[in-house]
Interface confidence: low
């Protein structure tokens, strides 16, 4: 099973490098590297680095396996984040004394600013930072559906942890739905899994930026760690390009 | 972007066909096609055809996407099925009047007959035939854990259906666990999703071979349609071969 | 699996994932990607001999199918199996952008 | 996608899934597989031109990356993307066996 052709490893490496040059520009739909003339001096803004790190870090519940990618997914996705509506907002008033759940509301207009059209959205993740905890709990996520009804989205078994840990839930369908509706406040409910016969239905999980004892942290550095939506979307100008070249080869 | 080499399509097809000859024998770990000398005359037994059809048909909740396959998964898996313990068995007595759940028990010794060693099991699916239904319901599956405790395994949102439909749950880990323990009766619970504030926790889903009004069907043709475990496992003799050649290339 | 754990620590001649770090500045002459400075792109390389099952005794050939031609291809090829995305930060004018590029990092290879 | 829907209804010269039905009896001379009698194995075929980005203007080249070399390989290759298993029934002695063979049917291809 030997092969007589000797492989020029250096040539292969260089061909791979040159192909990557084209691949990156192609994924970003750039004909040449972007001009750096207007780039402000100094380091990257904190918020941008935080967003980059959010994207880079694998979090609990995220899959590392690649899916066969549809054509549109070949192109780069712009990553933005939309923070949960501030806990001091009146909308949270009626949810204060519910022990089995915590609530997270989002302003659809903030989401629409990041993703102007529903089809542009390729992924939306709800990210929550869970504080350290010595108990195991089975939790569930719901989407606000109508005035008093909630639609089940998913669940997770949370094991004890010594350090804060980020949780991620895929909420792409939900956010796309919100974008298809008018502006307004939409929300999620994060609940204890209530069994048919169990009596203790209290949520024992503390979420950064929500759990009562942390409420004083808002406006401080912890504000960055309150629940947020991580959005991945095709930028509008790139999508128009994609749409106009939808013919094959 | 034209290529100057003309492709001999017939040669490619022949090479593909010849490669498939080797591939099938290789996956079955056969050095040559098996002798047909002892094959009984007549058509295939009903039960074998039913099993073949169960394997062939994609069912609700099963993924069509291929996973990157570990080495052992390259080889063929023998498919067997183990029916749920008969509903007339005394073990079901104490579960009769529970409205939020139905119960399915299995004899570990039946499973062990099909899969003598836990590592041989590559997939186990619990298959249930849901009867036609006009209601939507969110259901959950649990594994019997200890005397009175149940471990959550998964959930499904069941939409209305005009025809009976097969449901499939991946229970590979659970069955492997059972094989690691001694013989005995083990079980699953199929429940309504009980929310923290909802009052109606009744299971509205009817399962063939379980739901009370169908109990008279047992022992008839419907017996084939009562809940069963579909097991895919490496046959013992093939596994020993695999184990002895675990060195690379 | 023909992954980084196995391939980077062996001298496998056949299909395997090979190490390749790309420094955006040195290798591509690019300073416009602000983060990361480079990444482990890696690549797949090595023969996947075509196994013509009648050419030799089955017993010798069958054991080779799993690695060399598991898909029974007419001309098997060493290609990526597991891939990972790469997030980058760059500027468009004065505006920083974070974008995720899919399938950029090769973690393992296979004969396909 | 380079799947059966697109490829079987077009005259695509580049990488695509090609039709191939295998009749166990006629094509392999086998009578020992009782079910099925054959199956649509299909296969991948067609060039994936290597795109050397400096050989021509970027604008002409970049649009081709998506199909011809999305993985930025040094030598892209037309290989299966989506595969499906094949269950078979055969006898060992007097005992019928149902076995599932993984990744036997090619549903779509890709340049990788």
């Amino acid at each position: 099973l030997s092969t007589c052709k000797t492989i020029d490893m250096e040539l292969v490496k260089r061909k791979r490098i040159e192909a990557i040059r084209g691949q990156i520009l192609s994924k970003l739909r750039l004909a040449s590297p972007p001009s750096q003339g207007e780039v402000p001096p100094g380091p990257l803004p904190e918020a941008v680095l935080a967003l980059y790190n959010s994207t880079r870090d694998r979090v609990a519940g995220e899959s590392a396996d690649p899916e066969p990618e549809p054509e549109a997914d070949y192109y780069a996705k712009e990553v933005t984040r939309v923070l949960m509506v501030d806990r001091n907002n009146a909308i949270y008033e009626k949810t204060k004394d519910i022990s089995h759940s915590i609530y997270m509301f989002f302003n659809t207009s903030d989401i629409r600013e990041a993703v102007p059209e529903p089809p542009l959205l390729s992924r939306a993740e709800l990210r929550l930072q869970r504080l350290k905890s010595s108990v195991e709990q089975h939790v569930e996520l719901y989407q606000k559906y109508s005035n008093n009804s909630w639609r089940y989205l998913g669940n997770r078994l949370l094991t004890p942890t010594d350090t804060p840990e980020w949780l991620s839930f895929d909420v792409t369908g939900v956010v796309r739905q919100w974008l298809n509706q008018g502006d307004g406040i939409q929300g999620f409910r994060f609940s204890a899994h209530c069994s048919c016969d169990s009596k203790d239905n209290k949520l024992h999980v503390e979420i950064n930026g929500i759990s009562p004892k942390r409420r004083g942290d808002l406006g401080t550095i912890h504000d960055m760690n309150r629940p947020f939506l991580l959005l991945m979307a095709t930028p509008l100008e790139r999508a128009q390009h994609l749409h106009s070249s939808r013919h094959r080869r | 972007l034209s290529t100057c080499k003309t492709i001999d399509m017939e040669l490619v097809k022949r090479k593909r066909i010849e490669a498939i000859r080797g591939q099938i024998l290789s996956k079955l770990r056969l050095a040559s096609p098996p002798s047909q000398g002892e094959v009984p005359p007549g058509p295939l037994p009903e039960a074998v055809l039913a099993l073949y059809n169960s394997t062939r048909d994609r069912v609700a909740g099963e993924s069509a996407d291929p996973e990157p396959e570990p080495e052992a998964d390259y080889y063929a898996k023998e498919v067997t099925r183990v029916l749920m313990v008969d509903r007339n068995n005394a073990i079901y007595e104490k579960t009769k009047d529970i409205s939020h759940s139905i119960y399915m028990f299995f004899n570990t010794s039946d499973i062990r007959e099909a899969v003598p060693e836990p590592p041989l099991l590559s997939r186990a699916e619990l298959r249930l035939q849901r009867l036609k239904s006009s209601v939507e319901q969110h259901v959950e599956l649990y594994q019997k854990y200890s005397n009175n405790s149940w471990r959550y395994l998964g959930n499904r949102l069941l939409t209305p259906t005009d025809t009976p439909e097969w449901l499939s749950f991946d229970v590979t880990g659970v069955v492997r666990q059972w094989l690691n323990q001694g013989d005995g009766i083990q079980g699953f619970r199929f429940s309504a999703h009980c929310s923290c504030d909802s009052k109606d926790n009744k299971l509205h889903v009817e399962i063939n071979g379980i739901s009370p009004k169908r109990r008279g069907d047992l022992g008839t043709i419907h017996d084939m349609n009562r809940p069963f475990l579909l097991l895919m496992a490496t046959p013992l003799e093939r596994a020993q071969h695999l184990h002895s050649s675990r060195h690379r290339r | 699996a023909l992954d980084t754990n196995y391939c980077f620590s062996s001298t496998e001649k056949n299909c395997c994932v090979r190490q390749l770090y790309i420094d955006f500045r040195k290798d591509l002459g690019w300073k416009w990607i602000h983060e990361p400075k480079g990444y482990h792109a890696n690549f797949c390389l090595g023969p996947c001999p075509y196994i013509w099952s009648l050419d030799t005794q089955y017993s010798k050939v069958l054991a080779l199918y799993n690695q060399h031609n598991p898909g029974a291809s007419a001309s098997p090829c060493c290609v990526p199996q597991a891939l990972e995305p790469l997030p980058i930060v760059y500027y468009v004018g004065r505006k920083p952008k974070v974008e995720q590029l899919s399938n950029m990092i090769v973690r393992s290879c296979k004969c396909s | 996608a380079l799947d059966t829907n697109y490829c079987f209804s077009s005259t695509e010269k580049n990488c695509c899934v090609r039709q191939l039905y295998i009749d166990f009896r006629k094509d392999l001379g086998w009578k020992w597989i009782h079910e099925p009698k054959g199956y649509h194995a299909n296969f991948c075929l067609g060039p994936c031109p290597y795109i050397w980005s400096l050989d021509t203007q970027y604008s002409k080249v970049l649009a081709l990356y998506n199909q011809h070399n999305p993985g930025a390989s040094a030598s892209p290759c037309c290989v299966p993307q989506a595969l499906e298993p094949l269950p078979i029934v055969y006898y060992v002695g007097r005992k019928p066996k149902v076995e599932q063979l993984s990744n036997m049917i090619v549903r779509s291809c890709k340049c990788s």
Epitope: E10, L11, R14, A31, S32, G37 | - | R25, D27, L28, G29 | -
Partner: antibody, heavy 124, light 108 residues
Framework: QVQLVESGGGLVQPGGSLTLSCAAS????????MTWVRQAPGKGLEWVSS????????YYADSVKGRFTISRDNAKDTLYLQMNDLKSEDTAVYYC?????????????????WGKGTLVTVSS | QSALTQPSTVSVSLGQMARITCQGG??????AHWYQQKPGQAPVLVIH???SRPSGIPERFSGSRSGGTATLTISGAQADDEGVYFC???????????FGGGTELTVL
């Protein structure tokens, strides 16, 4: 230390041919992209041709395309420029230059080492 | 006609700062490199990738690029800095490396 020494220049009539050589030392020649640059008397620098480290890819200025051929022999650490159908406007000092980076296309990169040059005069 | 435009001459007093500019081509997107050439000698790289100095080049040499203009700065010019300075970049429309016409620096 890095050295590049050009040779092969001289006087040639229009329509004639000449082959320039550049002997390299002090670095791993086979890893680097190499370039020929020329300078007409009293004028600026003009890029002529570049070649990939393995010789697999070659690039030419429009003014010399079809007449000049760049090549290399990595076993001998030598770069060549075969010049045919020479014209009076090809009169210049021809420099051989090494790219600053490995794995890198010279189209974008600086050239960190240059030879002293060899004069080519095309005149009748 | 060069694809990159440089002033043909720049004069500077000894010890003062000299600035040579280079415009055009694809300088909005691609790096600039600078070479010094003395009469009868080969060019010498003094700045590469806009602002990187090769070893052996004095610290008084620096470079920058903003928008479509690259600038070579000599802070405290010395008599030895006299010569012709060429900028070099890539022109994406020609798909080729390009040089400026050269700037003769005189130190007074």
């Amino acid at each position: 230390q890095v050295q590049l020494v050009e040779s092969g220049g001289g006087l040639v009539q229009p329509g004639g041919s000449l082959t320039l050589s550049c002997a390299a030392s002090g670095f791993t020649f086979s890893n680097y992209y190499m370039t020929w640059v020329r300078q007409a008397p009293g004028k600026g620098l003009e890029w002529v041709s570049s070649i990939y480290s393995t010789g697999s890819h070659t690039y030419y200025a429009d003014s010399v395309k079809g007449r000049f051929t760049i090549s290399r022999d990595n076993a001998k650490d030598t770069l060549y420029l075969q010049m045919n159908d020479l014209k009076s406007e090809d009169t210049a000092v021809y420099y051989c230059a090494k790219n600053i980076y490995t794995y890198y296309t010279a189209h974008y990169a600086g050239m960190d080492y240059w030879g002293k040059g060899t004069l080519v005069t095309v005149s009748s | 006609q060069s694809a990159l435009t440089q002033p043909s001459t720049v004069s500077v007093s000894l010890g003062q700062m000299a600035r040579i500019t280079c415009q055009g081509g694809s300088l909005g997107s691609y790096d600039a490199h600078w070479y010094q050439q003395k009469p009868g000698q080969a060019p010498v790289l003094v700045i590469h990738d806009d602002n990187s100095r090769p070893s052996g080049i004095p610290e008084r040499f620096s470079g920058s690029r903003s928008g479509g203009t690259a600038t070579l700065t000599i802070s405290g010019a010395q008599a030895d800095d006299e010569g012709v300075y060429f900028c070099h970049s890539y022109d994406s429309s020609a798909n080729a490396p390009v040089f400026g016409g050269g700037t003769e620096l005189t130190v007074l």
